[in-house]
Interface confidence: medium
């Protein structure tokens, strides 16, 4: 449905408040270094222009595409070349190349200061002084640090952020009320950002077909009572929404997401019995709720899959007529029967099935050739089951911190060329799989664990892509989206790695470690652990454990000392010498 003015259409659909918020997010995700005030000025100019188009859709420039309007606006920034270097060259291009150019310059790890939370009184005063600016600043700071954050979902986070301040700044104990809410929003926000980053990587690196396959599997698990045609419609719509958001088309994305939520709620009887509560909520909550809704119960008496996909004489005929539709039906039927499998496992099974049909449908006796295809699934299913069992046992034995340390050592030995901050961040997140998933019963462990690991390993892939240092990482990240985790799991110690030279400065600590939070202190220790492994990749677990135990005792001792700095200087030298001796450095 063509509109005379796209900007007027979106302004009217979304309303002024959401329009302004989404334009701010879009601009902050593109120009991540620009000051807040500059972005607000640009957003206000775009909004005023949109209002003129709402009043008269035939007014000058109102017929231009959103990419043209927004790109023109971004290219007016005076310090573009100075701040962004070659990104300024994007402005010499025409649409759609200009937008593609901006997208390519999005930075997953921008050089921005850590968001340090000030005292609660500071935040409450700022909130009361100017609520609108306060909330815009939240959108801006999150969007520029997470350039692929799912924009309509960020509006939902901002709504909760506002609600937290509205409630807690009036409470008797503001901090007790507010801080846990902010912690929860921060943790959920990081998880949401990482999940969306995987969706965008899937679309951008592996194409629409890969994303659609993921969506068929996940929606079939979630809505096992829905017909294949219904699931296909939802997959098509969902793919459009995420393609738009990942492509920077945030107004279209938010609009289409609202339409999809509306459709799902109007047709919930043919989709899922679990949607009722979600569909009673306001728009932002509704969309979030649908995205997180639990799996519906599987229909009773589902027939065996073998009849249609192995035993039937028409398998090759059906496959040849419409390959992707037939494979989609296979994936749908398999996924709705297996909420206990991870999406990536289901996709591996579908890939195996596809490869078998490609080979067998060209054979002399196709049926004889593919008759045992389901037997090939057994090792694929057992591999993640065994891995999860072993790692959950290790997690239960060690606890989260020491489990993270075991993964730090494991991954540093696999890919020692990767930067220490990236190894620490990724391994800490990999280690969180324990507390997140091992508490679940067997039937929920694999979808929880392996799909979460896919999200975390994608963080490693996108960070590594910015500064590639390891061929092994590049290989695991680019060869197959669904086999990333098995690829990393299969990596052994990198025998080609030349150990890093020992640098005492890396292991020099100061009294400031004593004032750090427990989490920050853990990160300091884990950074030292990674560096140790980089210096001595052949160190045994026992050797590393002894050094880390000594290190923990050293920090505890010096933090209790009267003259902390002297203690760190003197005891630190002894610790470094003892560690060098213990590890043979």
């Amino acid at each position: 449905d063509a509109h005379k003015s796209e900007v007027a259409h979106r302004f009217k659909d979304l309303g002024e408040e959401n329009f302004k918020a989404l334009v701010l997010i879009a601009f902050a995700q593109y120009l991540q270094q620009c000051p807040f005030e500059d972005h607000v000025k640009l957003v206000n100019e775009v909004t005023e222009f949109a209002k003129t188009c709402v009043a008269d859709e035939s007014a000058e420039n109102c017929d231009k595409s959103l990419h043209t309007l927004f790109g023109d606006k971004l290219c007016t920034v005076a310090t573009l070349r100075e701040t962004y270097g070659e990104m300024a060259d994007c402005c010499a291009k025409q649409e759609p190349e200009r937008n593609e150019c901006f997208l390519q310059h999005k930075d997953d790890n921008p050089n921005l200061p850590r968001l340090v939370r000030p005292e609660v009184d500071v935040m409450c005063t700022a909130f009361h002084d100017n609520e609108e600016t306060f909330l815009k600043k939240y959108l801006y700071e999150i969007a520029r640090r997470h350039p692929y954050f799912y924009a309509p979902e960020l509006l939902f986070f901002a709504k909760r952020y506002k609600a937290a301040f509205t409630e807690c700044c009036q409470a008797a104990d503001k901090a007790a009320c507010l801080l846990p809410k902010l912690d929860e929003l921060r943790d959920e926000g990081k998880a949401s950002s990482a999940k969306q980053r995987l969706k965008c990587a899937s679309l951008q690196k592996f194409g629409e077909r890969a994303f659609k396959a993921w969506a068929v599997a996940r929606l079939s698990q979630r809505f096992p009572k829905a017909e294949f045609a219904e699931v296909s419609k939802l997959v098509t719509d969902l793919t459009k929404v995420h393609t738009e958001c990942c492509h920077g088309d945030l107004l279209e994305c938010a609009d289409d997401r609202a339409d999809l939520a509306k459709y799902i709620c109007e047709n919930q009887d043919s989709i899922s019995s679990k949607l009722k509560e979600c569909c009673e909520k306001p728009l932002l909550e509704k969309s979030h709720c649908i995205a997180e809704v639990e799996n519906d119960e599987m229909p009773a008496d589902l027939p065996s899959l073998a009849a249609d996909f192995v035993e039937s004489k028409d398998v090759c005929k059906n496959y040849a007529e419409a390959k992707d539709v037939f494979l989609g039906m296979f994936l749908y039927e398999y996924a709705r029967r297996h909420p206990d499998y991870s999406v990536v496992l289901l996709l591996r099974l579908a890939k195996t099935y596809e490869t078998t049909l490609e080979k067998c449908c060209a054979a002399a006796d196709p049926h004889e050739c593919y008759a045992k295809v389901f037997d090939e699934f057994k090792p694929l299913v057992e591999e993640p089951q065994n891995l999860i069992k072993q790692n959950c046992e290790l997690f239960e034995q060690l606890g989260e911190y020491k489990f993270q340390n075991a993964l730090l050592v494991r991954y540093t030995k696999k890919v020692p060329q990767v930067s220490t901050p990236t190894l620490v961040e990724v391994s800490r997140n990999l280690g969180k799989v324990g507390s997140k998933c091992c508490k679940h019963p067997e039937a929920k462990r694999m979808p929880c664990a392996e799909d979460y690991l896919s999200v975390v390993l994608n963080q490693l892939c996108v960070l590594h892509e910015k500064t590639p240092v390891s061929d092994r990482v590049t290989k695991c990240c680019t060869e197959s989206l669904v086999n990333r985790r098995p690829c990393f799991s299969a990596l052994e110690v990198d025998e080609t790695y030349v150990p890093k030279e020992f640098n005492a400065e890396t292991f020099t600590f100061h009294a400031d470690i004593c004032t750090l939070s427990e989490k920050e202190r853990q990160i300091k220790k884990q950074t030292a652990l990674v560096e140790l492994v980089k210096h001595k990749p052949k160190a045994t677990k026992e050797q590393l454990k002894a050094v880390m135990d000594d290190f923990a005792a050293f920090v505890e001792k010096c933090c209790k000392a009267d003259d902390k700095e002297t203690c760190f200087a003197e005891e630190g030298k002894k610790l470094v010498a003892a560690s060098q001796a213990a590890l043979g450095l």
Epitope: V116, P118, E119, D129, T515
Partner: nanobody, 115 residues
């Protein structure tokens, strides 16, 4: 509304010193930061002081500038020594520390360094 009022700027020759003050209306805020904006440039962080008294400085001012505060007077200071021509800018303070500002910007105070 929280008001941030910067003062102490002026014109000095290279090698000279200035002490900037920033008063936050109403109460003492933590953390605090000093920022500056030179003509045609983006505003940048110069120095910050945390709730625990820890400090951070831009590489270009390390060893020459010192940030401190007087909690009793709700004031944060920036002692600027060995000034250089490239320190010429409007200096602003804000609540929030390094690179982060929680309140609207004040008018700032102009520092000009030239011979």
């Amino acid at each position: 509304q929280v008001q941030l009022v910067e003062s102490g700027g002026g014109s000095v020759q290279p090698g000279g010193s200035l002490r900037l003050s920033c008063a936050a209306s109403g109460r003492n805020f933590n953390p605090m930061g000093w920022f500056r904006q030179a003509p045609g440039k983006q505003r940048e962080s110069v120095a910050a002081i945390g709730t625990d008294g820890s400090t951070k400085y831009a590489d270009s001012v390390k060893g020459r500038f010192t940030i401190s505060r007087d909690n009793g007077k709700n004031t944060v200071y920036l002692q600027m020594n060995s000034l250089k021509s490239e320190d010429t800018a409007v200096y602003y303070c804000n609540v929030g520390g390094w690179g982060i500002s929680w309140f609207p910007w004040g008018r700032g105070t102009q520092v000009s360094v030239s011979s």
